[in-house]
């Protein structure tokens, strides 16, 4: 018998955020662990800490199976919070733990990333 499709049971794993330009970061991740669940879209929520506290985050969708995305137009001097979920036609799975990225002023632009 065929099993009914299910929404992803877990979040994307191994989320990493790396500053690749002064105002652009690369987010990468791996598909959710567990049984083979089809993922047709990843949703990235991100915002500066200040905006996040105010509930004002950006929503970025990545259709398909590519597990990378660019976060563009970031503002130096802010710490950004990023989390990701996987979804398919059935529904959306849980969000990953938040990862933080410090976008430092140009003269000290080493990226600082740590799981929250």
């Amino acid at each position: 018998h065929s099993t009914l499709p299910e929404a992803p049971a877990g979040p994307p794993v191994g989320v990493k955020v790396t500053l690749i330009e002064d105002d652009t970061a690369l987010v990468s991740w791996k598909p959710p662990d567990g049984p083979e669940t089809v993922v047709t879209r990843y949703t990235i929520l991100y915002a500066s800490r200040k905006a996040w506290i105010a509930g004002e985050w950006q929503v970025l969708h990545r259709e398909g199976a590519i597990t990378m995305a660019l976060l563009e137009n970031l503002v130096a001097g802010n710490v950004y919070i990023v989390k990701i979920s996987a979804s398919n036609e059935v529904g959306e799975g849980p969000f990953s733990n938040s990862v933080e990225l410090a976008v430092l002023p140009k003269e000290t632009s080493e990226s600082n990333q740590r799981p929250k």
Partner: nanobody
Framework: EVQLVESGGGLVQPGGSLRLSCAAS????????MSWVRQAPGQRLEWIGW????????RYGQGFTGRFTISRDNSKNTLYLQMNSLRAEDTATYYC?????????????WGQGTLVTVSS
């Protein structure tokens, strides 16, 4: 359905040139900025640059000014990357990227990539 299809990659000798194309469909290409990125085998992704839609002005990532030129032809819905004086370290898969707003949300689309191999 949004589609980005890169072409123009292949094998080129050091010092040679290539022009990559990215044909866009499924959205109003002329309304949005576009980016090129690349990823060499086993290396982190690099941001090559971005081109504005209104002015057509490109902005380049660190290390990509001079040998690389980004342009676009809105009448053909096509983005270009001209690469000159190619070196072995330019060997990578090159992707075009568009980020298209839909209300308050954004949809980001990547092409399938085109492989450039610089070798003698």
């Amino acid at each position: 359905e949004v589609q980005l299809v890169e072409s123009g990659g292949g094998l080129v000798q050091p010092g040679g040139s290539l022009r990559l194309s990215c044909a866009a469909s499924g959205f109003t290409f002329s309304n949005y900025g576009m980016s090129w990125v690349r990823q060499a085998p086993g290396q982190r992704l690099e941001w090559i640059g971005w081109i504005d839609t209104k002015t057509g002005n490109p902005r380049y990532g660190q290390g990509f000014t001079g040998r690389f030129t980004i342009s676009r032809d809105n009448s053909k819905n096509t983005l270009y990357l001209q690469m000159n004086s190619l070196r072995a370290e330019d060997t990578a898969t090159y992707y075009c990227v568009s980020t298209v707003p839909n209300g308050v949300e954004y949809f980001q689309h990547w092409g399938q990539g085109t492989l450039v191999t610089v070798s003698s």
